[in-house]
């Protein structure tokens, strides 16, 4: 299963960030988004969005904190490899 592509983190504020990515139409049933403070491995927040979505606004972030975010495509119960990025609020 190919991973989503072109993960971009934009509009970063002290407590939010916009994620956007690309994928072929109907390539995935859904996407899994996983993010965490980079220093706190194992405390990830995981959420899903429908396969038709190509963006998501992360909210409730901590100011001045580095985050690692990964997105997985899901199709038929299978997960793609992750596409990842790092950003700081």
């Amino acid at each position: 299963l190919p991973a989503p592509k072109n993960l971009v983190v934009s509009e970063v504020t002290e407590d939010s960030a916009r994620l956007s990515w690309t994928a072929p139409d109907a390539a995935f049933d859904s996407f899994l988004i996983q993010y965490q403070e980079s220093e706190k491995v194992g405390e990830a927040i995981v959420l899903t969005v429908p396969g038709s979505e190509r963006s998501y606004d992360l909210t409730g972030l901590k100011p001045g904190t580095e985050y690692t975010v990964s997105i997985y495509g899901v199709k038929g119960g299978h997960r793609s490899n992750p596409l990842s990025a790092i950003f700081t609020t």
């Epitope: 859904s30 899994l32 927040i45 995981v46 959420l47 899903t48 969005v49 606004d57 909210t59 119960g77």
Partner: antibody
């Protein structure tokens, strides 16, 4: 696609632990986020928490320590650790489709806490 | 925690008419808002997510709008079947918090 059915709701006395079970059909829990929501009689909806895996659980601040959410490959459980009369409500299990927005719900199970 | 305030508590409108329900967040939540319809004895039904995206199978008579802190659900061409309680929900969650629901608005169809 898919269905959810809650069970385990009953009359309990205050302080008696109670576990509710959500049995899942037609949903792959390994790639799904599930939630528990409750509704007291005549009141509004109240989110308790969400689970992806047994490591990835998220609780409302008021619910932390009072509830435990866990799952197997086919069920999602909600344990009420020490029920009080204020926990009397219908408890719903649901699938999250867009972050915490939930598109598939069970019919709910009624918990009554009374001495 | 983010507090969601819904107004009014109850609203009525004639068959074929339009009603509007408002939801205000205590802080900026961007577009992380959902709307539900619930009838007595039934679980909630998701109508709208991402503030304005219609859930699968939901009539286009339902329209969600807004972002930031102010959101609106508009129901046009009211039908008797629209009589229900409508609730908004902040849909984000994370470490130590879970998005909350508004108190609900009862829609009466005359």
């Amino acid at each position: 696609g898919g269905s959810l059915e809650e069970s385990g709701g009953r009359l309990v006395t205050p302080g008696t632990p109670l576990t509710l079970t959500c049995t899942v059909s037609g949903i792959d829990l390994s790639t799904s986020v599930m939630g528990w929501v409750r509704q007291a009689p005549g009141k509004g909806l109240e989110s308790i928490g969400f689970i992806y895996t047994n490591v990835n659980t998220y609780y409302a601040s008021w619910a932390k320590g009072r509830f435990t959410i866990s799952r197997t490959s086919t069920t999602v459980d909600l344990k009420i650790t020490s029920p009080t009369t204020g926990d009397t409500a219908t408890y719903f299990c649901a699938r999250a489709v867009y972050a915490g927005a939930m598109d598939l719900w069970g019919q709910g199970t009624l918990v009554t806490v009374s001495s | 925690d983010v507090v969601m305030t819904q107004t009014p508590a109850s609203v009525s409108g004639p068959v074929g008419g339009t009603v509007t329900i408002k939801c205000q967040a205590s802080e900026r939540i961007y577009s992380n808002l959902a709307w539900y319809q619930q009838k007595p004895g039934q679980p909630p039904k998701l109508l709208i997510y991402k503030a304005s995206t219609l859930a699968s199978g939901v009539s286009s008579r339902f329209k969600g709008s807004g972002s930031g802190t102010e959101f609106t659900l508009t129901i046009r061409d009211l039908e008797c079947a629209d009589a229900a309680t409508y609730s908004c929900q902040y849909t984000s969650y994370g470490s130590g918090y879970v998005g909350t629901f508004g108190g609900g608005t009862e829609v009466v169809v005359e």
